[in-house]
């Protein structure tokens, strides 16, 4: 297992519709063809997996149908979007990137993006 640098923004504010987007960029040491991206959430010293996708370079990221994440890739950048967020989902969202193929295997973990989600106050049919 070899280490790899992963960069992501420090802070992101979710929209009023509970959508947060951020870029996860990795410094690929070689010509990887298969990449796995995992989003982890750290809150109250607990780390949980939010979503994960494996993709072939040049192709779209494919998350599970019921995933709260969507994403696109461009070179060594992955544009991640998380939806359905509410105030209780505020936390540190960590981007983990694995270069699966060809060998050698590389692993990179970002410092995390603090996503803030604010519950709106009552107003006609606002998004919560």
């Amino acid at each position: 297992c070899k280490a790899m640098h992963v960069a992501q923004p420090a802070v992101v504010l979710a929209s009023s519709r509970g959508i947060a987007s951020f870029v996860c960029e990795y410094a690929s040491p070689g010509k990887a063809t298969e990449v796995r991206v995992t989003v982890l959430r750290q809150a109250d010293s607990q780390v949980t997996e939010v979503c994960a996708a494996t993709y072939m370079m040049g192709n779209e990221l494919t998350f599970l149908d019921d995933s709260i994440c969507t994403g696109t890739s461009s070179g060594n950048q992955v544009n991640l979007t998380i939806q359905g967020l509410r105030a209780m989902d505020t936390g540190l969202y960590i981007c983990k990137v694995e270069l699966m193929y060809p060998p050698p295997y590389y692993l990179g973990i970002g410092n995390g993006t603090q996503i803030y989600v604010i519950d709106p106050e009552p107003c006609p049919d606002s998004d919560f």
């Epitope: 949980t48 149908d65 709260i68 105030a87 209780m88 989902d89």
Partner: antibody
């Protein structure tokens, strides 16, 4: 085990207010949202609003704006739904239901419901 | 407002039949849709959440599918205890609207 226990049946006159309680136990009260849903006799389910027991913020269906207030008491793990200006069409069973954050592992929305509180509005 | 339209509004089927209920949403809600069963006189019971996830303890004959605006609840082999009204509900954000319900009876 998780339980949501609601207050008993109420009979109110038109124009009056009613306050229904929902006491939670068996889980961390402030870690789940709470919704209120009502069901008129022989009718479908109608979402009324949601409250965040942690911060106390709430959001209501447009239909109930100005008439409904949702509050919570963290010391007793209880949420309240108060509906004012009662009319006969407010006669219904009122339910509370919990809802976890989307990122909670193995968390399913609306997985536990209260037993329901029948509110009858009659002169 | 986002509208949820269930079809059919009522149906009658025989024990062992495969039953399908659909829920059409007026705008894209990704996979944020729940399905409930409410037996006569009972509290609503969560069957499926986020389109296709089984709630713990729900019989495997129930399944859900769909994404975007079109969703389906399927009962692979109808049982007598499935006599109930079934509701879909959007859970993406407020308002957490319910469909009007589908009343299922046994022939």
């Amino acid at each position: 085990q998780v339980q949501l226990v609601q207050s008993g049946a109420e009979v109110q006159k038109p124009g009056a207010s009613v306050k229904v309680s929902c006491k939670a136990s068996g889980y961390t009260f402030t870690s789940y949202y709470m919704h209120w849903v009502r069901q008129a006799p022989g009718q479908g389910l109608e979402w009324m609003g949601i409250i965040n027991p942690s911060g106390g913020s709430s959001n209501y269906a447009q239909k109930f704006l100005g008439r409904v207030t949702m509050t919570r008491d963290t010391s007793t793990s209880t949420v309240y739904m108060e509906l004012s200006g009662l009319r006969s069409e407010d006669t219904a069973v009122y339910y509370c239901a919990r809802d976890p954050p989307i990122t909670m592992v193995r968390g399913a929305p609306f997985d536990y419901w209260g037993q329901g509180t029948l509110v009858t509005v009659s002169s | 407002d986002i509208q949820l339209t269930q079809s059919p509004s009522s149906l009658s089927a025989s024990v062992g039949d495969r039953v399908t209920i659909t829920c059409r949403v007026s705008q894209d809600i990704s996979s944020f849709l729940n399905w409930y069963r409410q037996k006569p006189g009972d509290v609503p019971e969560l069957l499926i959440y986020r389109s296709s996830n089984f709630q713990s303890g729900v019989p495997s004959r129930f399944s859900g599918s769909g994404s975007g605006t079109d969703f389906t609840l399927t009962i692979s082999s109808l049982q007598p205890e499935d006599v109930a009204t079934y509701y879909c509900q959007r859970t993406y954000n407020a308002p957490y609207t319910f469909g009007q319900g589908t009343k299922l009876e046994i022939k």
